[in-house]
């Protein structure tokens, strides 16, 4: 005998209590594929989560994070606290980037400044906690005839960088 449940479309479930009639998924539940014998409970976007898209009969709710947090993981499974630019999130909270590193976003880790000398270039603009250094032409390009061994200008403390 053909399984009548296979005729039930997404957004419904095959109700065995009603001779395999397709019943609509009740509020706060969904079925994303046909032929389901139950509907799945909709995700609730509460606490640090907020609703991006409501749960429909055929698709789960989509969540985002409230202000001050950002999504992590597939389908925004977690919300992580934002930090300021120039900081990174540690187990003890937001901490300033160490000297020689920067973070230009509200999330993620502090990354080392670019080493301009590795590309044979000099530092044009010093790095800060929030911004990477800007590399300029090589010292040789700046002063023709100068020794190519001339070191780049030393990067200064972020707090002392020109504004």
């Amino acid at each position: 005998l053909q399984d009548l449940c296979s005729n039930c479309p997404a957004g419904t479930f095959c109700d065995n209590n009603r001779s395999q009639i397709c019943s609509p998924c009740p509020p706060n539940s969904f079925s994303s594929a046909g032929g389901q014998r139950t509907c799945d409970i909709c995700r609730q976007c509460k606490g640090v989560f907020k609703t991006r898209k409501e749960c429909s009969s055929t698709s789960n709710a989509e969540c985002d994070c409230i202000s001050g947090y950002h999504c992590l993981g597939a389908e925004c499974s977690m919300c992580e606290q934002d930090c300021k630019q120039g900081q990174e999130l540690t187990k003890k909270g937001c901490k300033d980037c160490c000297f020689g590193t920067f973070n230009d976003q509200k999330r993620g880790i502090c990354r080392p400044w670019t080493n301009c000398s590795l590309d044979g270039k000099s530092v044009l603009v010093n790095g800060t906690k929030e911004r990477d250094v800007v590399c300029g032409p090589s010292p040789a390009d700046l002063s023709p005839g100068a020794s190519s061994a001339t070191p780049p200008a030393p990067a200064r403390e972020p707090g002392h960088s020109p504004q």
Epitope: G11, P24, K50
Partner: antibody, heavy 115, light 112 residues
Framework: QSVEESGGRLVTPGTPLTLTCTVS????????MIWVRQAPGEGLEYIGF?????FTYYASWAKGRFIISRTSTTVDLKMTSLTVADTATYFC????????????WGPGTLVTVSS | DVVMTQTPASVSEPVGGAVTIKCQAS??????LAWYQQKPGQPPKLLIY???TLASGVSSRFKGSGSGTEFTLTISDLECADAATYYC??????????????FGGGTEVVVK
Amino acid sequence: QSVEESGGRLVTPGTPLTLTCTVSGFTINSYHMIWVRQAPGEGLEYIGFINDGGFTYYASWAKGRFIISRTSTTVDLKMTSLTVADTATYFCARGVDGTSYPDLWGPGTLVTVSS
Amino acid sequence: DVVMTQTPASVSEPVGGAVTIKCQASQSIGSDLAWYQQKPGQPPKLLIYRASTLASGVSSRFKGSGSGTEFTLTISDLECADAATYYCQCIYYGSDDVIYHTFGGGTEVVVK
């Protein structure tokens, strides 16, 4: 719990207009808040809504010309480039059970666009 | 766009009778359909959502059924107060934050 619209009036084509929906007895940011309109003697037309998370969704014909925003107690519908075809009663409503199905409606406010 | 075709446009039945209104979606919408009642000079009233869930305070004489593309509203034991225009409405999300929460054209119910 109640919903009430205001701001409807007679305007000339091209005039921008903002309608305001004021609620009492519930918190706006816990519900989907919806705008629907109805031209005289015609059927219902869904404009769009702002959901509990603050995200806005619009009907394809309304996107770009209508903007829905909210405060803690009001929901605004900003309308631009109005034409005679926008003459209608504009309803604000609250969604039921975490959805955008309107269940608590205001009485409506009439917008007449005429030269 | 999702098009909702509602039939009939008008129906007349005696008190105590029954009325069946159909709504057809141009594509499958699962069970994301609602029914509303509207009387002249008043805002609509939600009767049923999720195809068959009765809204709060609505009489059990109103029954919604269907899924996919075919939906039905049945009003049994008609009362004079049921004279109104009835609308179906779907919920369907398109891409780019566009919604197709389309209403049907409406059915006028006359109670004799």
